[in-house]
Interface confidence: medium
């Protein structure tokens, strides 16, 4: 049981386009055909103006027109919904497909891709119907951009809603060694972080989030998966002790602001007959800023758990109320392989923390920054949705 760990199945709240808790000022666009099809008319089920956002120019062939929603705080976005321009039945414009881009800081933008690397999302078949798209994997974002597509020169219009929940973990990124491949007798088990949205260099992944923060915990048998049509090992990220002569895997975690850390929870595989073992112990250090030194002695937690039970499980590592914005944790090998499917944190924001959004990123620059106003401290009013993908409204 991952206490304090978010459940993606319950993270499906409307985030405020339709009910207007997202203000007009937080919706922006690359261009508009007219004031009556401006950004503010892009709300799902809205009939204001001419009934949708419509870009000024064609989206074919360049696909550069976008609708941007600023959620003000980091959210896990699990679904999106789209509609065309209804306009009392007179509108005929809709987008048959679209792409999504997202950002956590307004500087670096990532393309959303599904679990097989596909970026293009099937959209609407008519102007009025709502099509919901389950985002697998979900995205942790503050800003989301919709890029409507067309296969020829034609008018497209869009109304949208986003569904998800507040990203309470506060985790901005983790740095980890690239996951490896385990060769078993009957199968190759790919234990890479296949949805990681940061950078990869020198055998390290940095500056992003991926499968270790997607809410999906792995099965007892790591060769099997919660997801359909994926490869063996999909739910886990894993490392072989043969590649780590130091005897541990080291990871770093960066958070949105200064936090007091109670617990880290790591969902691990323990199928020891295939070499996967719980870590023998964990050591964590803390620091308050990127340029600072790691503070004091690390918090050490010995595990030395039972080998016998092969079931996957969450291990809780007490972090003793230490304060920081960065953590560095070493996971000690107790067997040939370490396999993790999820890492989450139970923490509290330090009240006097003025550092409410990360400083300039240390990753390569992306598009120019968007101007942010001050962050809201409370989540918006949220209404649960429980619709299946493509279900009627």
């Amino acid at each position: 049981d991952m206490k304090g760990h978010f459940d993606p199945a319950k993270c499906r709240y409307a985030l405020g386009m339709q009910d207007r808790t997202i203000p007009d000022s937080d919706i922006s666009v690359s261009s508009s055909w007219s004031d009556s099809t401006a950004a503010r008319h892009s709300r799902l089920e809205s009939s204001d103006g001419d009934g949708a956002w419509c870009p000024a120019g064609p989206v074919f062939p360049k696909e550069e027109e976008y609708l941007q929603v600023d959620l003000r705080r980091l959210h896990l976005v699990a679904l999106v919904g789209t509609q065309g321009r209804h306009a009392g039945g007179l509108g005929k414009e809709f987008s048959r497909s679209y792409r999504l881009r997202y950002s956590r800081d307004g500087r670096r933008w990532m393309d959303w891709k599904d679990r097989w690397g596909q970026e293009v999302i099937s959209g609407n078949e008519d102007p009025g119907g709502v099509v919901l798209k389950d985002l697998g994997p979900p995205m942790v974002a503050r800003l989301v951009r919709f890029y409507p597509r067309a296969d020829r020169v034609m008018s497209v219009c869009l109304r949208v809603e986003l569904y998800g929940c507040l990203w309470r973990d506060g985790l901005l990124s983790y740095t980890a060694p690239v996951g490896q491949t385990m060769q078993l007798s009957e199968v190759m088990v790919h234990l890479n972080d296949s949805t990681y949205d940061g950078y990869t260099a020198g055998g390290l992944q940095y500056g992003g989030l991926g499968q270790l923060a997607d809410g999906v915990v792995g099965l007892d048998d790591f060769r099997q998966s919660q997801e359909l049509r994926v490869w063996p090992g999909y739910d886990y990220v894993g490392w072989s002790n043969q590649s780590f002569p130091t005897g541990y895997v080291e990871m770093e975690f960066e958070f949105d602001r200064l936090r007091t850390f109670q617990t880290m929870q790591v969902h691990c595989n323990n199928m020891h007959t295939l070499g996967a073992r719980l870590p023998g112990g964990v050591e964590c250090r803390f620091k308050r800023g990127p340029a600072m030194a790691w503070e004091g002695e690390p918090v050490r937690h010995a595990l030395g758990g039972s080998l016998g039970d092969p079931r996957a499980r969450a291990i809780s590592v007490p972090l003793g109320g230490h304060v920081g914005r960065f953590l560095q944790c070493r996971f000690l090998f107790a067997g040939p392989w370490l396999l993790f499917s999820e890492i989450s944190f139970i923490s509290d924001v330090v009240n006097d923390s003025s550092d409410t959004f990360p400083p300039a990123p240390w990753w390569p620059p992306g598009p120019p920054p968007t101007n942010f106003s001050s962050l809201e401290l409370e989540p918006r009013g949220q209404q649960p949705v429980a619709k299946a993908e493509g279900s009627p409204t």
Partner: antibody, heavy 121, light 103 residues
Framework: EVQLQQSGPELVKPGASMKISCKAS????????MTWVKQSHGKNLEWIGL????????SYNQKFKGKATLTVDKSSSTAYMELLSLTSEDSAVYYC??????????????WGQGTSVTVSS | QIVLTQSPAIMSASPGEKVPMTCSAS?????MHWYQQKSGTSPKRWIY???KLASGVPARFSGSGSGTSYSLTISNMEAEDAATYYC?????????FGGGSKL
Amino acid sequence: EVQLQQSGPELVKPGASMKISCKASGYSFTGYTMTWVKQSHGKNLEWIGLINPYIGVTSYNQKFKGKATLTVDKSSSTAYMELLSLTSEDSAVYYCARLYDRGGRYAMDYWGQGTSVTVSS
Amino acid sequence: QIVLTQSPAIMSASPGEKVPMTCSASSSVSFMHWYQQKSGTSPKRWIYDTSKLASGVPARFSGSGSGTSYSLTISNMEAEDAATYYCQQWNSDPWTFGGGSKL
């Protein structure tokens, strides 16, 4: 048909060592972990340890560490258990058993016929 | 280590009778396996994951339980069911067997 064929009965002297074999057929030998079990006096069963033939991972019951050594020969699909420094307490029937581990649930689904070991001077 | 205590250690039953046997664990376990062994032969996997019947096991056998208390029941005893039944856990290191119930 899955079969585990063990070597024949052994009479050994105290202090000696011996090796029991378990030849597997009817399935992919490297695809399943092999376990070993001791049965004393025709009654109590004790788990000795296990070995994954493909990746060579072994795990032992602490009680049998230093007493039993598990190995495999992949080319002949044979698992071995060597028993060291035998005493009368080691007189028993020893079984190899294939471990079914699909879905993260473990059970010994096929057993060898057993090898009787008698330690006596 | 987890100690499994089986009861009764020895029992007898007539054909057609309902036969229950229990396996009590010294600490909570998540699943229990049962093996059947007839005199002079190897054990056979009989019930696994607490309640699933192994291939070829008659439907008159059933398994149930949770935590520290598990049971195997024969709803309608037949002569061929005469054997010793062992419970086994893999929740904790080392894996352990019960002392057996001889039927």
